[in-house]
């Protein structure tokens, strides 16, 4: 039961995390105008990975896309790439993990296959989370670096040269969403990897035990002791006979509305 719970929770946490990474990537508030000692402003600037926006005190908001690839800073391109890689890996990981879920029965898929798929999706979630955290951190570092460079006639945000002290930008909501989402995806991935250990077929000292109701001989087939590799052994007490019973993890045996056939 613990394995299913760990796997299911890992999936849900990763799902929330990836949804957060997608949301962060699409958000416009990656950097927002620093209001320092002036909480009310007539013109408020904020920028995302794909466009920059201006909100006037009148309530009118205007957003302009960055309709250039070559003209954008390399760091911004790198952040975009990291976030997209994170989303793609996360999406593939989600797809794989759906089929790896123990509570979902797909034909006669063996536990070993599910274990491998769980491990694969777990690794994908970990890499996805790391990509998101890296992307957000690179952008945050850019902001910190540029924060004090607010002298006259300097490059400002995505704009050009101006005749005033440049607009200073600080961390936007998207950065915090990205950090949290990346962390959740990472945690979800770790949980999937932990669940994988419990899903892998158990290698015991007794490879098989034959029971013959009519016969007098009981055949023991000893199996050589195998050192655990970490993911290979199962810490659960699985029954080594097939008497029609199943472990708690295998209770759902009949197709239901949750099954993928």
């Amino acid at each position: 039961m613990a394995v299913t719970a760990c796997q299911g929770l890992g999936f849900v946490v990763s799902l929330i995390g990836i949804a957060g990474i997608i949301a962060a990537t699409c958000m416009d508030q990656w950097s927002t105008q620093d209001l320092y000692n002036n909480p009310v402003t007539a013109v408020f600037n904020y920028q995302g990975l794909w466009r920059s926006c201006v909100r006037e005190s009148s309530g009118f908001t205007e957003c302009r896309g960055y309709f250039t690839l070559l003209g954008l800073p390399a760091m911004l391109q790198a952040v975009r790439a990291l976030m997209i890689v994170g989303i793609v890996l996360g999406a593939i990981g989600l797809l794989v993990s759906i089929f790896a879920l123990k509570c979902i029965r797909i034909g006669s898929m063996e536990d070993s296959a599910k274990a491998n798929m769980t491990l694969t999706s777990g690794i994908m979630f970990i890499v996805s989370g790391l990509c998101a955290i890296a992307g957000v951190s690179v952008f945050a570092n850019m902001l910190v670096t540029n924060f004090w460079m607010s002298t006259a006639n300097m490059y400002t945000g995505m704009g050009g040269m101006v005749q005033t002290v440049q607009t200073r930008y600080t961390f936007g909501a998207a950065l915090f969403v990205g950090w949290v989402a990346g962390g959740l995806t990472l945690i979800g991935g770790v949980m999937m990897c932990i669940a994988c250990r419990g899903l892998a077929p158990e290698e015991t000292n007794y490879k098989a035990v034959s029971y013959h109701a009519s016969g007098h001989s009981v055949a023991y087939k000893p199996g050589g002791f195998k050192a655990s590799t970490g993911f290979g052994s199962n810490t659960k007490n699985k029954k080594i006979y097939d008497g029609g019973a199943r472990t708690e993890d295998e209770v759902q045996s009949y197709p239901s509305k949750h099954d993928y056939v």
């Epitope: 013109v43 600037n45 309530g59 009118f60 205007e62 302009r64 704009g159």
Partner: antibody, heavy 118, light 113 residues
Framework: QVQLQQPGAELVKPGTSVKLSCKAS????????THWVKQRPGQGLEWIGM????????NYNEKFKSKATLTVDKSSSTAYMQLRRLTSEDSAVYYC???????????WGQGTSVTVSS | DIVMTQSPSSLTVTAGEKVTMTCKSS????????????LTWYQQKPGQPPKLLIY???TRESGVPDRFTGSGSGTDFTLTISSVQAEDLAIYYC?????????FGSGTKLEIK
Amino acid sequence: QVQLQQPGAELVKPGTSVKLSCKASGYTFTSYWTHWVKQRPGQGLEWIGMIHPNSGSSNYNEKFKSKATLTVDKSSSTAYMQLRRLTSEDSAVYYCTRIHYGNAMDYWGQGTSVTVSS
Amino acid sequence: DIVMTQSPSSLTVTAGEKVTMTCKSSQSLLNSGNQKNYLTWYQQKPGQPPKLLIYWASTRESGVPDRFTGSGSGTDFTLTISSVQAEDLAIYYCQNDYSFPFTFGSGTKLEIK
């Protein structure tokens, strides 16, 4: 069409208070900030402050913080400005305005002429 | 606060003439985020409230005759009336819309000969 209706004139005594009204019609009152502007006879324009009818949040020119209080009544689509401790310096025409693109004041009331005299 | 300085304080012209008035701000009104200048021009005729002519330094308000043109960027702005008409007799004000408190210039009084 958009209209901002203000009473024509107010005659008040020094040291007292006056509450000026501005009734909006022809647009969604709660969607636009209402601003107030002062114009002394034969002089220029001074921005007093603004209020958002929906949230009630306001922002004042530091110069008028102790002089003016902005309020709204959403039900009647009316903005109010209370001026306190009136002196002859407060004798002026007070306009209410609405702002739109570019933070520009696109519609103005006809103005209320406040005369402070004993 | 941003100080707005208008010049000349008054000018007298004949109908049909081209008129230019200037407005200088103590700080730039150019917003880097959208590359727009937050400067507005108003026209105030005697006994009337001001009327919006131009916003974003050069965008003409709907219904305003095309003889009115706004230009400039940063700290220096100009309002041009290509061919003055008798009904243009008024005081013209420029206003900072970029930062609070919003501030107005002292005005340029246009008189017709």
